[in-house]
Interface confidence: low
């Protein structure tokens, strides 16, 4: 298609070398043709709609992005050559920074309804730069933090080092939605609510001599509760016995519950003790079960292929730690009376002394 | 367990002020969101409001201009005060808590309900 | 405020039966919206939240879908303690809303 006809937007995105951070280009087609396609979305402050500039999110996903090739090729489909570029609904996100991504990318409609639509289309022309080290080391981060029922703020990473007098207007959009309130480096919330949480991106107009460019940052914000003051909890094992099968095959859980912290390092471990003997059981790893705002359950089992009569003289630790501190559940297994036959019994003397054999030759004790 | 326990008055005079606490056993009721929501006889449910541990609150606002909750930490309780009551404020009330779940996004979830408390509304 | 339209507001099924309740929104609320089951004079029980995830404890019979405007929960083969009223609720923006309820008896 003829994409001399698009709208044209500059855009800028200057990327810190120090850290992670994404990228977003808008659909964003021209308010002037109201065809099928081309409506700004209409919504009220209370909502929080997906996108921007469409009518209906439910008919609505379908845009197709290109990217030109600066040679003059033929346009490009974003999906089939890019994996680090994905595109949602109205939008195009880069997963990853990197001069690379330089270029022009355009945004039509997918279905054309009508002979409007062809010219239904915005060609945003990407430059991409790494950020020049002489700027301020405290510029403001990439992802942040607010904290639940407290004051907070949102600054745009590429205006922090300035004072808001220096400042030009911004424009904030959250989840892809016009913030109307506020026209400044950062977005003070006086009381935060959950609904804060989402992804924000904060334009400002640079000009030069020759053009003028749209500076785009964007900024994942979550909203935390405070970090815990409490080591872990284990939910499970909640008996310090187990009665088991000799030859038998066994699986012990232990499941954990870790307050949040916003740096988060959870440990959980299973020794085994015996006699004065200690050491650290490699099992599969551990696997978070249930994740809320205010903390996180933690599972990691321990497996034995067959009991055997030596397990019974162990005794089985699960270690779990956080930044505040550590606790342990120990478990002995005890034989269940009239379980298994002869048989079994002979079998698990076998394991067992192949088992004695391995771990002299194999594991690692510490006292 | 955590458990919920609506009380207060069975019965409230027109123009009067409904009263109900929800006390929380077996758990903390710091870190949640605590909500009260109603059901009249033989209709649906409807919400009122609900408390964070830090007392901030949210209102219907179909309700909002004769609604307050309120939070006692120490006491493990939430109270509801409705005030001016009608006839039409006869229900049976129910205090639940909200967790918020993680999956990529934070999502509420009204996880813990009380039994249930009938208020009638008559002179 | 959003409202949810459920449907059908009743109906008959037979142990066994597969049924699929649907709840309707005003506007798109992404996926957030639970539903909830209530038998006569006991507190609604929490089934789904965020469209389709189970509560722990809850049966595998019992799924949702959906996203937007147009949620369904579907119970693959209806039990003896599945006759009661389903609730569906959005959690999208305030106030939380609930449907109207559907009611499932036994035929």
């Known amino acids: 298609f003829n994409i001399s006809g698009c709208s044209t937007k500059k855009l800028l995105w200057a990327y810190s070398t120090r850290s992670e951070e994404e990228f977003i280009l808008f659909c964003d087609l021209p308010e002037p043709q109201k065809s099928h396609f081309c409506h700004r979305s209409q919504l009220s402050p209370t909502q929080v709609p997906d996108h921007l500039p469409f009518t209906d999110s439910k008919d609505l996903p379908d845009v197709q992005w290109y990217r030109q090739p600066s040679n003059g090729d033929p346009l490009e489909d974003i999906r089939k050559s890019y994996p680090h570029i994905i595109q949602d609904k109205c939008t195009l996100r880069f997963l990853t920074p990197g001069v690379n991504n330089t270029g022009s990318y355009i945004c039509r409609p997918k279905m054309i309804k009508s002979p409007y639509d062809v010219a239904c289309c915005v060609k945003m022309i990407l430059e991409v730069k790494p950020q020049s080290n002489a700027s301020c080391e405290n510029s403001a981060s990439h992802k942040q933090d607010l904290l639940l029922g407290s004051t907070g703020s949102i600054s745009c990473p590429s205006l922090s080092c300035q004072s808001d007098a220096q400042s030009p207007e911004v424009t904030w959009y959250k989840n892809g939605k016009l913030l109307s309130m506020t026209r400044s480096n950062r977005i003070v919330v006086d009381e935060v609510y959950i609904y804060h949480q989402g992804t924000y991106v904060c334009d400002y107009t640079q000009s030069d001599t020759a053009s003028s460019w749209t500076v785009r940052a964007v900024v994942q914000v979550r909203t935390i509760v405070g970090d815990t003051k409490l080591k872990p909890d284990i939910l499970d094992p909640v008996e310090s016995t187990l009665e088991v099968e000799l030859g038998k095959p066994l699986t012990i859980s232990c499941k954990a519950r870790f307050g949040f912290e916003r740096v988060f390092n959870p440990v959980m471990k299973w020794y085994i003790k015996d006699a004065d003997l200690e050491w650290e059981v490699s099992v599969p790893e551990a696997k978070s079960i249930k994740s809320t705002l205010k903390d996180e359950i933690i599972e990691r089992n321990i497996i034995l292929e067959k009991v055997t009569q030596r397990d019974l003289r162990r005794t089985f630790v699960c270690f779990v730690q956080n930044s505040i501190g550590n606790t342990t559940q120990s478990v002995q297994l005890k034989e269940k009376r009239g379980s298994g036959g002869l048989n079994d019994i002979f079998e698990a003397q076998k394991i067992e002394w192949h088992e004695t054999v391995r771990f002299q030759s194999h594991h690692h004790h510490h006292h | 367990q955590v458990q919920l326990q609506e009380s207060g008055p069975g019965l409230v005079k027109p123009s009067e002020t409904l009263s109900l606490t929800c006390t929380v056993s077996g758990g903390s009721i710091s870190n949640y969101y605590w909500t009260w929501i109603r059901q009249p006889p033989g209709k649906g449910l409807e919400w009122i409001g609900y408390?964070?541990?830090?007392?901030?609150?949210n209102y219907n606002p179909s309700l909002k201009s004769r609604v307050t909750i309120s939070v006692d930490t120490s006491k493990n309780q939430f109270s509801l005060k409705l005030s001016s009551v009608t006839a039409a404020d006869t229900a049976v009330y129910y205090c639940a808590r909200e967790t918020i779940v993680v999956r990529g996004f934070y999502f509420y979830v009204m996880d813990v309900w009380g039994q249930g408390t009938t208020v009638t509304v008559s002179s | 405020a959003i409202q949810l339209t459920q449907s059908p507001s009743s109906l008959s099924a037979s142990v066994g039966d597969r049924v699929t309740i649907t709840c309707r929104a005003s506007?798109?609320?992404?996926?957030?919206l639970a539903w909830y089951q209530q038998k006569p004079g006991k507190a609604p029980k929490l089934l789904i939240y965020d469209a389709s995830n189970w509560e722990s404890g809850v049966p595998s019979r019992f799924s949702g879908s959906g996203s937007g405007t147009d949620f369904t929960l579907t119970i693959s083969s209806l039990q003896p303690e599945d006759f009661a009223t389903y609730y569906c609720?959005?959690?999208?923006?305030?106030?939380?809303?609930f449907g109207q309820g559907t009611k499932v008896e036994i035929k």
């Open positions: 506007q798109g609320i992404s996926s957030a």
């Open positions: 408390i964070s541990d830090s007392g901030s609150t």
């Open positions: 609720q959005q959690f999208n923006s305030y106030p939380w809303t």
